[in-house]
């Protein structure tokens, strides 16, 4: 029987922020409750001279009035005692986009092909997650190599999220677009 308590989830050992920096394309996602990036999601991670990690992300968001906008999001990461677990503060460049604070865990990555991210926003009393989200990232916008897919599927299982992901379309919708010139 799988242990689905969040405290039991393993993350990347000796996570290296510098090696993780650069462009990552989201290939699949498990959504949380509420408004969330839909598709065409691309993230750019960087590390400054003090060692702080930050990220920018772009993706299509469907607003409540059924408007599609390409959202520019920014996130800054605060280190914790585990090098693969961060506190992420995020906000949208446009005022109507979400802002907040989430845990941001790098569950696994080989830095060159794949990465699995996980965040639990709300715990159940039994320690399992009541509201989580997760991304599968690839360095290649065309997808993951087969051997990486196998590893990712295993990680999805270990997060007790197997088959709760949806594939993410990359069709160029947000190329050269942002919410500033859409609205």
């Amino acid at each position: 029987e799988r242990d689905c308590r969040v405290s039991s989830f393993r993350v990347k050992e000796n996570f290296d922020k510098a090696r993780f920096s650069g462009t990552w394309y989201a290939m699949a996602k498990k959504d949380p409750e509420g408004l969330f990036l839909q598709d065409n999601i691309v993230a750019e991670f960087s590390v400054d001279e003090t060692g702080q990690m930050s990220a920018t992300a772009k993706g299509r968001v469907r607003l409540l009035n059924n408007w599609d906008v390409c959202a520019d999001m920014v996130g800054t990461f605060t280190d914790t005692e585990d090098p693969a677990k961060f506190k992420m503060k995020y906000w949208g460049v446009a005022s109507f986009l979400q802002k907040g604070n989430d845990d941001h865990w790098i569950v696994d990555t080989d830095y060159d092909t794949y990465a699995v991210q996980y965040s639990c926003r709300l715990l159940n009393l039994d320690g399992t997650c009541a509201d989580s989200y997760s991304f599968v990232f690839s360095r290649d916008p065309n997808g993951l190599p087969p051997e990486a897919q196998k590893i990712v599927r295993q990680r999805q299982e270990e997060l007790c999220l197997a088959r709760q992901y949806r594939l993410i379309v990359h069709n160029g919708y947000c190329d050269g677009r942002s919410e500033r010139n859409l609205l």
């Epitope: 699949a28 051997e147 897919q149 999805q156 088959r163 709760q164 992901y165 594939l167």
Partner: antibody, heavy 120, light 107 residues
Framework: QVQLQQPGAELVRPGASVKLSCKAS????????MNWVKQRPGQGLRWIGM????????HYNQMFKDKATLTVDKSSSTANMQLSSLTSEDSAVYYC?????????????WGQGTSVTVSS | DIQMTQSPSSLSASLGGKVTITCKAS??????IAWYQHKPGKGPRLLIH???TLQPGIPSRFSGSGSGRDYSFSISNLEPEDFATYYC?????????FGGGTKLEIK
């Protein structure tokens, strides 16, 4: 666009075997499982099994374990299903359908089906 | 194995009308139900997945709802191209199981 191409029909003798093909195009073949589904005349749909084109990992419905063998040819992006020891019960339309490796495995695109008739 | 009981097996309706089809699972399928439209000589076409999520390009006349073991699928403002056979599919369990189908005919 996504296409799964299947031959229209196959006529085979009782006791013989038949190999059905499903040629995929319009997407990355190894990013999706390939499933096979059976439909007997006037009846509903029944899942036979699925294969991972990247390494030929298979999962079968136990009911078809001794009847169907799933294979792939990555070089031509083609999935195959061999049906053995055919009887009249195997006369049916057989569909291939893909499902995403990293997603929820939903059968999102289907071929048009191959009609297999077992008759002497 | 999970069984899916779909009803009715057939129904007739008028253009512009509304129909509802139900599927009952033999156990909780955690909303992992999909609905397909099937026409002769073609492969089934995915309309709805995860109980109520419309596939891209599928008109909002199609809708789905339910939870646990009980699920329903509706078509409103019926158009000529909607007359076909509809199937539910549970995909919570790796041994996919389809409902028996509902043939929708013009009244």
């Amino acid at each position: 666009q996504v296409q799964l191409q299947q031959p229209g029909a196959e006529l085979v003798r009782p006791g013989a075997s038949v190999k059905l093909s499903c040629k995929a195009s319009g997407y990355t073949f190894t990013n999706y499982w390939m499933n096979w589904v059976k439909q007997r005349p006037g009846q509903g749909l029944r899942w036979i099994g699925m294969i991972d084109p990247s390494d030929s990992e298979t999962h079968y419905n136990q009911m078809f374990k001794d009847k169907a063998t799933l294979t792939v040819d990555k070089s031509s992006s083609t999935a195959n299903m061999q049906l053995s020891s055919l009887t009249s019960e195997d006369s049916a339309v057989y569909y291939c359908a893909r499902s995403p490796q990293l997603g929820d495995y939903i059968l999102d695109y289907w071929g048009q089906g191959t009609s297999v008739t077992v008759s002497s | 194995d999970i069984q899916m009981t779909q009803s009715p097996s057939s129904l007739s309706a008028s253009l512009g009308g509304k129909v509802t089809i139900t599927c009952k699972a033999s156990q909780d399928i955690n909303k992992y139900i999909a609905w397909y439209q099937h026409k002769p000589g073609k492969g089934p076409r995915l309309l709805i997945h995860y109980t109520s999520t419309l596939q891209p390009g599928i008109p909002s006349r199609f809708s789905g709802s339910g939870s646990g073991r009980d699920y329903s699928f509706s078509i409103s403002n019926l158009e000529p191209e909607d007359f076909a056979t509809y199937y539910c599919l549970q995909y919570d369990n790796l041994l996919w199981a389809f409902g028996g189908g509902t043939k929708l005919e013009i009244k």
